[in-house]
């Protein structure tokens, strides 16, 4: 029951996390510009991974995509890649984990197969979460180190000069969404990996048994308490032999008529 709960909770947490990673990747507010008093109008500028926007004091908002890759910093491309890899891995992980859920029966799928799938999806969630956290952190580092706020390289040409607008950028909402979502996906992945251990416990042979004389003859079959791994024929964890043979812990627990001669 605990295993099913852990697995189910891990799935739900990862699902929320991956939804958050997708939301963060699509959001425009990765970096936001402090309300900058442009002489013309108060301009609020914010940027995402795919486009940048400007909102005027009048409420007018305009967004445009980055039409060229050439003018974009390499770090932005790296962040894009990390977030996309995170989404893809997370999506595959979700797909795998659906079939791995203990509460869902698909054909005659054995517990060992479900355990393997749970572990696979768990690892995928962990990597997905790490990708998202890494992507968001790289972008945040760009802001902290004033990546584009450094002294503008002004150059003159036939049309005068061009410069990058010197404005102060702060962390946008998408960064916080990304960090939280990445963390949730990571936690969900860890929970799936923990659940995997419960789904397929290690094979245990209780070999230390004491024998007592029994009134009726029985045929002893070794490995009576073999834990189920899905590979053996005893898949229901039933005692194969239960006629007078007890584990060491059970000896002298219940006196019987055979103990006294």
């Amino acid at each position: 029951m605990a295993v099913t709960a852990c697995q189910g909770l891990g799935f739900v947490v990862s699902l929320i996390g991956i939804a958050g990673i997708i939301a963060a990747t699509c959001m425009d507010q990765w970096s936001t510009q402090d309300l900058y008093n442009n002489p013309v109008t108060a301009v609020f500028n914010y940027q995402g991974l795919w486009r940048s926007c400007v909102r005027e004091s009048s409420g007018f908002t305009e967004c445009r995509g980055y039409f060229t890759l050439l003018g974009l910093p390499a770090m932005l491309q790296a962040v894009r890649a990390l977030m996309i890899v995170g989404i893809v891995l997370g999506a595959i992980g979700l797909l795998v984990s659906i079939f791995a859920l203990k509460c869902i029966r698909i054909g005659s799928m054995e517990d060992s197969a479900k355990a393997n799938m749970t572990l696979t999806s768990g690892i995928m969630f962990i990597v997905s979460g790490l990708c998202a956290i890494a992507g968001v952190s790289v972008f945040a580092n760009m802001l902290v180190t004033n990546f584009w706020m450094s002294t503008a390289n002004m150059y003159t040409g036939m049309g005068g000069m061009v410069q990058t607008v010197q404005t102060r950028y702060t962390f946008g909402a998408a960064l916080f969404v990304g960090w939280v979502a990445g963390g949730l996906t990571l936690i969900g992945g860890v929970m799936m990996c923990i659940a995997c251990r419960g789904l397929a416990p290690e094979e245990t042979n209780y070999k230390a048994v004491s024998y007592h004389a029994s009134g009726h003859s029985v045929a002893y079959k070794p490995g009576g308490f073999k834990a189920s791994t899905g590979f053996g024929s005893n898949t229901k964890n039933k005692k194969i032999y239960d006629g007078g043979a007890r584990t060491e812990d059970e000896v002298q627990s219940y006196p019987s008529k055979h103990d006294y001669v």
Epitope: Q33, N38, V40, T41, V43, N45, Q47, R51, S52, C53, V54, E56, S57, S58, F60, E62, C63, R64, G65, Y66, F67, G71, L72, P73, L76, W148, G159, G160, M161, V162, Q163, T164, V165, T167
Partner: nanobody
Framework: QVQLVESGGGLVQPGGSLRLSCAAS????????MAWYRQAPGKGLEFVSG???????NYADSVKGRFTISRDNSKNTLYLQMNSLRAEDTAVYYC??????????????WGQGTLVTVSS
């Protein structure tokens, strides 16, 4: 390559009028913020007038009621109509385009300037 080329400057008597033009190439004249700035001899850059993509228009207090900013999207040109000119309006006038959207780096483009001299 982005180019902003100002024209229309010259010598004018006090109370006269001039119309400055800023022809843009490589950039949309309906950019996020288009503006006129001026720099009087021995002084710093001063904002004159500007308009935004959203239609907001603003003027410096010193030119309100005398100057009018406009743009012609079909010609990709920004204009500054200057009436009732005074001696203190003598300066080099610069055209400026600030781009925030469609670029990861907000950019500010400047023309080479056109000289306006108000003198009797």
């Amino acid at each position: 390559q982005v180019q902003l080329v100002e024209s229309g400057g010259g010598l004018v008597q006090p109370g006269g009028s001039l119309r400055l033009s800023c022809a843009a190439s490589g950039v949309d004249i309906s950019s996020d913020v288009m503006a006129w700035y001026r720099q009087a001899p021995g002084k710093g850059l001063e904002f004159v007038s500007g308009l935004t993509r959203g239609g907001s228009i603003n003027y410096a207090d010193s030119v309100k009621g005398r100057f009018t900013i406009s743009r012609d999207n079909s010609k990709n040109t920004l204009y500054l109509q200057m009436n009732s000119l005074r001696a203190e309006d003598t300066a080099v006038y610069y055209c400026n385009a600030e781009i925030y959207t469609g670029t990861f780096y907000p950019r500010s483009y400047w023309g080479q300037g056109t000289l306006v001299t108000v003198s009797s």
